[in-house]
Interface confidence: medium
C-alpha cells in the first residue's frame, strides 16, 4: 500500500496492527470515546505485567514499588504515544493477577482511535521488555465515557 509508517514495519497479527494510522501518527485514526467540550478523547487501557507479582505495596502510592512502577509506566506511555495528540494518562491502578495495570489515556480529539491506541501499545511490547523489564500481555483498550457520561459508544466488544 502507498502509505507506510516507520514504526509499523511489519505485520504480525491483527491485534497488533489493526487500522494503522493513515496519515503519519500526528493525526492518527479512530476514537469511539465521547468527547468533552475541550476536545479530549479518553481510552481505558488494561494490561498484565506477567513477570511481576502483585503485593500490598501496589495498594499504597507511597511505597517505592508503587512509585517506581508508576514512573516506568508513565515514561513508557510517553515513549509509545509520542505524537502531538497525546495529552497524558491518569488513574493508574494496580490489581492482583501477576500485576494488572489499569489506566486512562487522554488524547486530543480526532487524533487517534481505539484500534490505534491498541496497535501502538502492542508494537511497543518488545521494547517494554528490554527497556523496562516489563513483560506485557492481555492488552485491552476501550473507549470511556468521561467524565462518566451515561453511554460510551455503540461499539460492542465481543
Amino acid at each position: 500500500t502507498p502509505t507506510t509508517l516507520a514504526s509499523h514495519s511489519t505485520k504480525t497479527d491483527a491485534s497488533s496492527t489493526h487500522h494503522s494510522s493513515v496519515p503519519p501518527l500526528t493525526s492518527s485514526n479512530h476514537s469511539t470515546s465521547p468527547q468533552l467540550s475541550t476536545g479530549v478523547s479518553f481510552f481505558f487501557l488494561s494490561f498484565h505485567i506477567s513477570n511481576l507479582q502483585f503485593n500490598s505495596s501496589l495498594e499504597d502510592p507511597s511505597t517505592d514499588y508503587y512509585q517506581e512502577l508508576q514512573r516506568d509506566i508513565s515514561e513508557m506511555f510517553l515513549q509509545i504515544y509520542k505524537q502531538g495528540g497525546f495529552l497524558g494518562l491518569s488513574n493508574i491502578k494496580f490489581r492482583p493477577g501477576s500485576v494488572v495495570v489499569q489506566l486512562t489515556l487522554a488524547f486530543r480529539e480526532g487524533t487517534i482511535n481505539v484500534h490505534d491506541v491498541e496497535t501502538q501499545f502492542n508494537q511497543y511490547k518488545t521494547e517494554a521488555a528490554s527497556r523496562y523489564n516489563l513483560t506485557i500481555s492481555d492488552v485491552s483498550v476501550s473507549d470511556v465515557p468521561f467524565p462518566f457520561s451515561a453511554q460510551s459508544g455503540a461499539g460492542v466488544p465481543g
Partner: antibody
Amino acid sequence: QVQLQQPGAELVKPGASEKLSCKASGHTFTSYWMHWVKQRPGQGLEWIGEINPSNGRTYYNENFKTKATLTVDKYSSSASMQLRSLTSEDSAVYYCASDGDYVSGFAYWGQGTTLTVSS
Amino acid sequence: NIVMTQSPKSMSMSVGERVTLTCKASENVGTYVSWYQQKPEQSPKLLIYGASNRYTGVPNRFTGSGSATDFTLTISSVQAEDLADYYCGQSYSYPWTFGGGTKLEIK
C-alpha cells in the same frame, strides 16, 4: 493478490439461521481484521461488525449484536457470520471485507452473498 | 452513532467534467474517512483512505480532501467508466458508518 471468496446466493426460510462464509487467500489471514457489511437492495452500506482472526476478538454494531455472530477458522483462513431469527428485513447482500496494510478502510471486498429470506 | 451525510444524492455529468462529491460527518472524525466506488452489480472498491490517500491502483483523477467533519471526493475529469455509486465511510468511532451514497450518472 488478496481474494475473499463468498458463495453467490443463499435461500432460507423465515425464522431460520444461516451461516455465511468468506474464505481468504493471498495474504496472511491473521494479520487483517475481517469485517462484514450489509447492503439491502437499492440501499446503502451498513457495517455489521469485525473480528480479529488472530484472537477471535470482535466488535459489533449494536444494531446487529443479537442478529449476527462472527467467527473465524485460522486453519482454513475462513471467516463466518451466523445470522439468526431471519426475517425479510435480513434479505440483503452481505459482504466480507478486510483491512489492508496501513489502511483504515476496507481494502479488500468479497463478491458478496445474496441472502434471500422467503417462505 | 456518527452520521455521514452525502450530497448530492445523484448527479449527471458529461465526460471530461469535474465532479465534486461531499460528505459531512455529524462529529469530528479526524481524517478517518474513506471513499468507496460501487459499480452496478459489483462489490464496493476502496478509492481513498485517511481522507486524502489514494489507494493502490486508483487513477489519479480521484482526489480526496478534508478533515474533522467536512470531506470531499473530486474527480478531475470524469470518464464513462466512473458511472457508479460513491460512498464515504468513517472508521473513527464505533460503529463504523457509511454515508447514504451519491449516484453518479454519465450524460
